[in-house]
């Protein structure tokens, strides 16, 4: 019969022969010949191969460097990589997360609109008018102004979008 | 067509070094592992030492072969080779070049190896 | 190193005879086990590969089973051209790669 030119899905072309890919998490160590099939063997401790393939070496799991911030959020396995994370208050620095950076804070007069994740910074925006923050955070929302009459007072002193109005009590009238 | 062709058996005295080579043709050499098995006069077979394909191709031994014997390939030539150091009577043997290293699919004719004084 | 110990080292026996050699691993070896047949002055020829698929071209008689430590040939039905060596080759697999052959198996005729 004539050699093939092109093989099925999960195969490979190879001396005019079509092969078995190795499955996932197994590496190539020979061909197929016409007497046996492809020749595969796992990946090693701290390897991987996530396709069907014909590599002669498995790639070795991301290592989640504590020193740049990282931790193993998922452990790899044979046939996917381990996937990193940041610790606590800091957050990835590229889709790769392949190192962190502390979550920014929100200035006085910005709040917390969006919470930092492992993979995404603090997103702040500017207190509207009638709400205001007056620290620098990477959690606080701004906080709206003390309403003085539902206390009974009066504005003394104007809010702003970093400060908190000052309520007084009302002045007397007098006889 | 497919096929291993070894060479470089000779008669030596004990100590003396020799290369054996595995010269492959028929097949992409490398993404193939290759093993080295010997067999001495009326015995059994007994595996010497395997290579990984690819660039790297990580080299294991038999036990009693590591340090004196070396498996290594050169790519662009499509060749095997075994150097074989500090040689002794007990590694007379014939030595086959196969393709593979958990099934042989593929051996070579074999070559002659005589230690001897 | 792994030992892989074949039994027996010589049968004798008649064609159309069922024949069985056993090869057992020192340790685990998963399904990495071959049979080989060897005919005097020739190189070894493969007839089962992973412990138990058959190497194309060799006689459906064939056949081979086991996993882990111990492993089986089986011969269904002897023929002429059987008598030989036969061989197993296990391969542990794992932070190394070590191969090592049985002893080998001589078949005679009886």
């Known amino acids: 019969p004539e050699p093939p030119t092109a093989c099925r899905e999960k195969q490979y072309l190879i001396n005019s022969q079509c092969c078995s890919l190795c499955q996932p998490g197994q590496k190539l160590v020979s061909d197929c010949t016409e007497f046996t099939e492809t020749e595969c063997l796992p990946c090693g401790e701290s390897e991987f191969l996530d396709t069907w393939n014909r590599e002669t070496h498995c790639h070795q799991h991301k290592y989640c460097d504590p020193n740049l911030g990282l931790r193993v959020q998922q452990k790899g396995t044979s046939e996917t990589d381990t996937i990193c994370t940041c610790e606590e208050g800091w957050h990835c620095t590229s889709e790769a997360c392949e190192s962190c950076v502390l979550h920014r804070s929100c200035s006085p007069g910005f709040g917390v609109k969006q919470i930092a994740t492992g993979v995404s910074d603090t997103i702040c925006e500017p207190c509207p008018v009638g709400f205001f923050s007056n620290v620098s955070s990477a959690f606080e929302k701004c906080h709206p102004w003390t309403s003085c009459e539902t206390k009974d007072l009066v504005v003394q002193q104007a809010g702003t979008n970093k400060t908190d109005v000052v309520c007084g009590p009302q002045d007397r009238l007098r006889a | 067509e497919v096929q291993l062709e070894e060479s470089g058996g000779d008669l030596v005295q004990p100590g003396a070094s020799l290369r054996l080579s595995c010269a492959a043709s028929g097949f992409d050499f490398n993404s193939n592992a290759m093993s080295w098995v010997r067999q001495a006069p009326g015995k059994g077979l007994e595996w010497v030492a395997s290579?990984?394909?690819?660039?790297?191709?990580?080299?294991y031994y038999a036990s009693w072969a590591k340090g004196r014997f070396t498996i290594s390939k050169d790519t662009s030539k499509t060749t095997l080779y075994l150097q074989m150091n500090s040689l002794r009577a007990e590694d007379t043997a014939t030595y086959f070049c196969a393709r593979g290293i958990t099934r042989l699919p593929l051996w070579g004719q074999g070559t002659l190896v005589t230690v001897s004084s | 190193d792994i030992q892989m110990t074949q039994s027996p080292s010589s049968l004798s026996a008649s064609v159309g005879d069922r024949v069985t050699i056993t090869c057992q691993a020192s340790q685990s070896i998963s399904s990495y086990l071959a049979w080989y047949q060897q005919k005097p002055g020739q190189a070894p020829k493969l007839l089962i590969y992973d412990a138990s698929k058959l190497a194309s071209g060799v006689p459906s008689r064939f056949s081979g089973s086991g996993s882990g430590t111990d492993f089986t040939l089986t011969i269904s039905s002897l023929q002429p051209e059987d008598f030989a060596t036969y061989y197993c080759q296990g391969t542990y697999y794992g932070s190394t790669t070590i191969s090592a052959f049985g002893q080998g198996t001589k078949v005679v005729i009886k």
């Open positions: 290579i990984y394909a690819g660039g790297s191709g990580s080299t």
